[in-house]
Interface confidence: medium
């Protein structure tokens, strides 16, 4: 039975050019984490393996930074970077768990950031 | 110590079918990519596949795509490499090597020679 | 399919830096990787992830990637180090090639 929930930093936006970290947090399971990947619709950006720790798309391999912890650090961001973007916690023995965190990048200088936790 | 063994020198006749193996010991063998390398003699390096044992994930190079098969039995933490109809042009030097995610082959087998002549 | 292009020979003096360039289109999106092969061996990874360098590999060897070429320096370069060079790239599919590899000579 899967009992774990992912917390996630939700509806984000930040200003073009920038950078924005991407969190998730699995609670509520004592499941072993084995990898956790990061993607933007059906597109691979990063894997964070247990064993084998970080390894980065290397179609991201220059916007993209590993951590802070499983998060995700996006660089150097554009307008195409908005969209969905979901993490995927692969456990033992429960299985999957998946969040979703909308990006918005915008033109404007002025960028609200979403709650941070 | 990390350690891939490949089975032993073949020589095979033209349409004979040969199946040339690769055992991993030393690391966790469903963590890691397998693949295959082929060098004709006196030739480069030819990315042919490769399998993640974990869940026998497997990709072909174009060129190699209907012309072998790659498997892996994870239970015996063994990859392969077979051929159904050999030919000639297949003489060559075989060698696995394994990877892990986007990093480069960082461990190789001492290859396997296979000698098609009739 | 997507094709990486080698110099066949470079030649360098004991001491003198080596550089091995390998081409492709955008290169520089893809993961380059180096092998070193003597005759005889099975090959050796020297770079991985365009800069990296796995343990046991001296300093000497560097690399990087961007545009469309990636580079292998070899700074002080050795007898030892006369060898057949291959740079390797990976896409996000896994799908891997190698460059057609270059015969390095050190003179002397």
């Known amino acids: 039975m899967m009992t774990g929930t992912i917390e996630t930093t939700g509806n984000i936006s930040a200003e073009k050019g920038g950078s924005i970290i991407l969190q998730c947090h699995l609670s509520s399971t004592t499941a072993q984490v084995t990898q956790v990947n990061w993607e933007q619709q059906d597109q691979l950006l990063a894997i964070c393996n247990a064993d084998l720790g970080w390894h980065i798309s290397p179609s991201f391999k220059d916007r993209v930074a590993p951590g802070p912890g499983l998060g995700l650090t996006l660089q150097s961001l554009t307008v195409n970077d908005t969209g969905e973007y979901f993490c995927i916690y692969h456990t033992y023995p429960d299985g999957t768990y998946t969040g979703r965190i909308f990006l918005e990048v915008l033109e404007s200088s002025v960028a609200e950031h979403g709650a941070r936790f | 110590e990390v350690q891939l063994v490949q089975s032993g020198a073949e020589v095979k006749k033209p349409g004979e079918s040969l199946k040339i193996s690769c055992k991993g010991s030393?690391?966790?063998?469903?963590?890691?990519?397998i693949g295959w390398v082929r060098q004709m003699p006196g030739k480069g390096l030819e990315w042919m596949g490769i399998i993640y044992p974990g869940d026998s994930d497997t990709r072909y190079s174009p060129s190699f795509q209907g012309q072998v098969t790659i498997s892996a039995d994870k239970s015996i933490s063994t990859a392969y490499l077979q051929w159904s109809s050999l030919k000639a042009s297949d003489t060559a030097m075989y060698y696995c090597?394994?990877?892990?995610?986007?990093?480069?082959?960082?461990?190789w087998g001492q290859g396997t020679l296979v000698t098609v002549s009739s | 399919s997507y094709e990486l292009t080698q110099p066949p020979s470079v030649s360098v003096a004991p001491g003198q830096t080596a550089r091995i360039t390998c081409s492709g289109d955008a290169l520089g999106d893809k993961y380059a990787s180096w092998y070193q092969q003597k005759p005889g061996q099975a090959p050796v990874l020297v770079i991985y992830?365009?800069?990296k360098r796995p343990s046991g590999i001296p300093e000497r060897f560097s690399g990087s990637n961007s545009g469309n070429t990636a580079t292998l320096t070899i700074s002080g370069t050795q007898a030892e180090d006369e060898a057949d060079y291959y740079c390797s790239a990976k896409d996000a599919s896994f799908n891997s090639v190698f460059g057609g590899g270059t015969k390095l000579t050190v003179l002397g």
């Open positions: 030393g690391y966790s063998f469903t963590s890691y990519w």
């Open positions: 090597a394994r990877a892990a995610w986007w990093q480069g082959f960082d461990h």
């Open positions: 992830e365009d800069s």
